[in-house]
């Protein structure tokens, strides 16, 4: 059974992941640039199901494309430093999903824009955090 300290650690990691995703979405929503239109043309794979920590495998597999899209957005008004940001998210995701079990991610048929993708994973984090508090 998970201990109180392990639950607290999981909750803090999920809160950090949530904040990182919210920071990206906020940066994109603030973005007044022709590049935004182009960013929205990139398609992301969405998980068929995302209800457990193991499903973060689906997020991990989309981190490289996410970094590429964020690199496109780099400018003096975009302060997210994609390499550092994605590296941070990657570390959190690896810790949260664990490496013991190999989970094959199943994706939905429909792809999504970066905004839909971020909102999906933000909702995922919020829903898991809610079960922990």
């Amino acid at each position: 059974a998970p201990t109180s300290s392990s639950t607290k650690k999981t909750q803090l990691q999920l809160e950090h992941l949530l904040l990182d995703l919210q920071m990206i979405l906020n940066g994109i929503n603030n973005y007044k640039n022709p590049k935004l239109t182009r960013m929205l043309t990139f398609k992301f794979y969405m998980p068929k199901k995302a209800t457990e920590l193991k499903h973060l495998q689906c997020l991990e597999e989309e981190l490289k494309p996410l970094e590429e899209v964020l690199n496109l957005a780099q400018s003096k008004n975009f302060h997210l430093r994609p390499r550092d940001l994605i590296s941070n998210i990657n570390v959190i995701v690896l810790e949260l999903k664990g490496s013991e079990t190999t989970f094959m991610c199943e994706y939905a048929d429909e792809t999504a824009t970066i905004v839909e993708f971020l909102n999906r994973w933000i909702t995922f984090c919020q829903s898991i955090i809610s079960t922990l508090t």
Epitope: M23, N26, L80, R81, N88, Q126
Partner: antibody
Framework: QVQLVQSGAEVKKPGASVKVSCKAS????????VHWVRQAPGQGLEWMGI????????SYAQKFQGRVTMTRDTSTSTVYMELSSLRSEDTAVYYC??????WGQGTLVTVSS | DIQMTQSPSSLSASVGDRVTITCRAS??????LAWYQQKPGKAPKLLIY???NLETGVPSRFSGSGSGTDFTLTISSLQPEDFATYYC?????????FGPGTKVDIK
């Protein structure tokens, strides 16, 4: 539990910049993301943005985009908020807050010619 | 951006009174709501997080309820040290936004 200590009051002229510091002690510096919130005299609370102290990346409220820069120095466990092109409406108390549950004491910035 | 409104904007009450402050979000924020208390010249102090969870060290006379768009902060028996301004704040999405505040003063 982390404690946050902010730099002292500042008086600035319109058009100038101000840099407010927020030093953390008592807990791991990178444990909590740091928000900056300001409060004009007699007014409510206004969120300015957030910085991840470990990664050093930040995200800002649209209102301050292009005028605010949040940075950090991990060697001194300090985060900074710099606001440029100051105008009289920027006169306020500026707070840093770790995870929005531990707050610094506030720094009064007065913008006056 | 999510707009937060509070009512009343101010109220006068006596020690021992039960006080209720309401907060409304312009769109659903689940339970991603916090309540703060602020006294003049001081930083805000977190009272309630996740709509109903009491922050460590906060007296049990404070309680929070609600979800979606409507939230309530209740002080079951007002104490002299509770005269202050109270703010709600949503953390469902960025930018983080605060309510305009409710000032509780002595009747």
């Amino acid at each position: 539990q982390v404690q946050l200590v902010q730099s002292g009051a500042e008086v600035k002229k319109p058009g100038a910049s101000v840099k407010v510091s927020c030093k953390a002690s008592g807990d791991t510096f990178t444990r909590h993301y740091v928000h900056w919130v300001r409060q004009a005299p007699g007014q409510g609370l206004e969120w300015m943005g957030i910085i991840n102290p470990s990664g050093g990346y930040a995200s800002y409220a649209q209102k301050f985009q292009g005028r605010v820069t949040m940075t950090r120095d991990t060697s001194t466990s300090t985060v900074y908020m710099e606001l440029s092109s100051l105008r009289s409406e920027d006169t306020a108390v500026y707070y840093c807050a770790a995870g929005l549950f531990i707050w610094g004491q506030g720094t009064l910035v007065t913008v006056s010619s | 951006d999510i707009q937060m409104t509070q009512s009343p904007s101010s109220l006068s009450a006596s020690v021992g009174d039960r006080v209720t402050i309401t907060c409304r979000a312009s769109q659903s924020i689940g339970r991603w709501l916090a309540w703060y208390q602020q006294k003049p010249g001081k930083a805000p102090k977190l009272l309630i997080y996740s709509a109903s969870n009491l922050e460590t060290g906060v007296p049990s006379r404070f309680s929070g309820s609600g979800s979606g768009t409507d939230f309530t902060l209740t002080i079951s028996s007002l104490q002299p040290e509770d005269f202050a301004t109270y703010y709600c704040q949503q953390a469902n999405s960025f930018p983080v936004t605060f309510g305009p505040g409710t000032k509780v003063d002595i009747k």
